[in-house]
Interface confidence: medium
Amino acid sequence: KVNVVTCTKHTYRCLNGLCLSKGNPECDGKEDCSDGSDEKDCDCGLRSFTRQARVVGGTDADEGEWPWQVSLHALGQGHICGASLISPNWLVSAAHCYIDDRGFRYSDPTQWTAFLGLHDQSQRSAPGVQERRLKRIISHPFFNDFTFDYDIALLELEKPAEYSSMVRPICLPDASHVFPAGKAIWVTGWGHTQYGGTGALILQKGEIRVINQTTCENLLPQQITPRMMCVGFLSGGVDSCQGDSGGPLSSVEADGRIFQAGVVSWGDGCAQRNKPGVYTRLPLFRDWIKENTGV
């Protein structure tokens, strides 16, 4: 068993209240908590197959490769934002997608349709695709629509999703979970494939890396808050872009399980040198998600 230590905000707390010295112990295939709670609720983050963002500089995803990726369509406008499936009833997305803007009531759940298990935007009626209306949109109460701080929202589905090879939830990281600088992470979406371009039909994927927070703050002065993280390459080339907002950053963790590291939020252009994409950190919102969804 792993050493039990004094609990801090940086340690994983087991259900029995004891805390572990081991980092990121959840759903890694090893029971580290004496009550086994670190391996409970782990029906997430696995794909049914194994094969060796606006995403700029990405490639076409395989069908079913990112079964938690969701496409949000606004009434009469087509795909607007991405989201991730975290349970049969709930999605995680970006709050800025749901601000009323230019005369359209984006904050109204009845104006949205979620497509789960979607691969090709032109094939929304394909087998395996599940269409769901939204019942509720919960934007973070601290969301700031000037700075994009706390850019996270929860979307409740009107009818639960049915898990399948194409539709599966992503794992949510514990509040203590660390995604270190340099870690490779995947960004996915149907957003623009170049800045000022057009959206992709086929789901795109791009591998990017977590950037040191101090570097991030220096690259985008006065704009980065503790709720944000930079992910990408200083050389540019691969990035999320307009239309990828709200989608997940997928991080392959121990035991091959995939955890959501962040939410696509904003950027200064797309895939530019020294302008990495900015994402909402997921671990900081674990308690808020649980309070609002029970997940």
């Epitope: 601000i99 230019r102 629509d145 530019q272 302008k275």
Partner: antibody, heavy 122, light 108 residues
């Protein structure tokens, strides 16, 4: 057609107060972030204050912080600027302007009113 | 705050000529966060360019923006009589949002 009509300007003594209004029409006012920008006679433009579409979040230039208050009434399609403790250097034409789509991370001003002149003098 | 310096202060040109206006920032603020406005006497400013290079709606294609880092340029490829005005650049990448002091384009 987007129309913004400012009113409430005039002559006021230093230390006095004034409330500017901006009546909006031709668009869904409640969906736009809004701003006030001023221009002193014969000078350049200076951003003063901004307010998000919901009215929840506000921003101010340091030169007016603590003296000016921006607000909006979405039911009346009106933007306001309450100006207190006015100084001679606040003399300017005050423009109200819509702020471009925040979803595109834009804070530039895409539609402007014709402005209202505020003169602070004894 | 970020100071934007525009040059030249005044540009004297004839209709049909090419105008090149410069805007230099005191520090980098995000290369996409620059706008250009046109203002004629007694009128409100009008948005020309946003995102450093994107033309606003109904702005003719003789207006173009370029640049990154701290140096930005507005180019009017062939001056029309209605283009003689004052032009301002504005950065919106760092609060407070600031304007340059303006460049006046006058008829030679």
């Amino acid at each position: 057609e987007v129309q913004l009509l400012e009113s409430g300007g005039g002559l006021v003594q230093p230390g006095g107060s004034l409330r500017l209004s901006c009546a909006a029409s031709g668009f869904t006012f409640s969906s736009y972030a809004m701003s006030w920008v001023r221009q002193a006679p014969g000078k350049g433009l200076e951003w003063v204050s901004a307010i998000s579409s919901s009215g929840v979040n506000t921003h101010y230039a340091d030169s007016v912080k603590g003296r000016f208050t921006i607000s909006r009434d979405n039911s009346k399609n009106t933007l306001y600027l309450q100006m207190n403790s006015l100084r001679a250097e606040d003399t300017a034409v005050y423009y109200c302007a819509t702020i471009a789509s925040i979803a595109l991370r834009g804070y530039y001003f895409d539609y402007w009113g014709q402005g209202t002149l505020v003169t602070v003098s004894s | 705050e970020i100071v934007l310096t525009q040059s030249p202060g005044t540009l004297s040109l004839s209709p049909g000529e090419r105008a090149t206006l410069s805007c230099r920032a005191s520090q980098t603020f995000g290369s996409s966060y620059l706008a250009w406005y046109q203002q004629k006497p007694g009128q409100a400013p009008r948005l020309l360019i946003y995102g450093a290079s994107s033309r606003a709606t109904v702005i003719p294609d003789r207006f173009s923006g370029s640049g990154s880092g701290t140096d930005f340029t507005l180019t009017i490829s062939r001056l029309e009589p209605e283009d003689f005005a004052v032009y301002y650049c504005q950065q919106y990448g760092s609060s407070p949002w600031t304007f340059g002091q303006g460049t006046k384009v006058e008829i030679k």
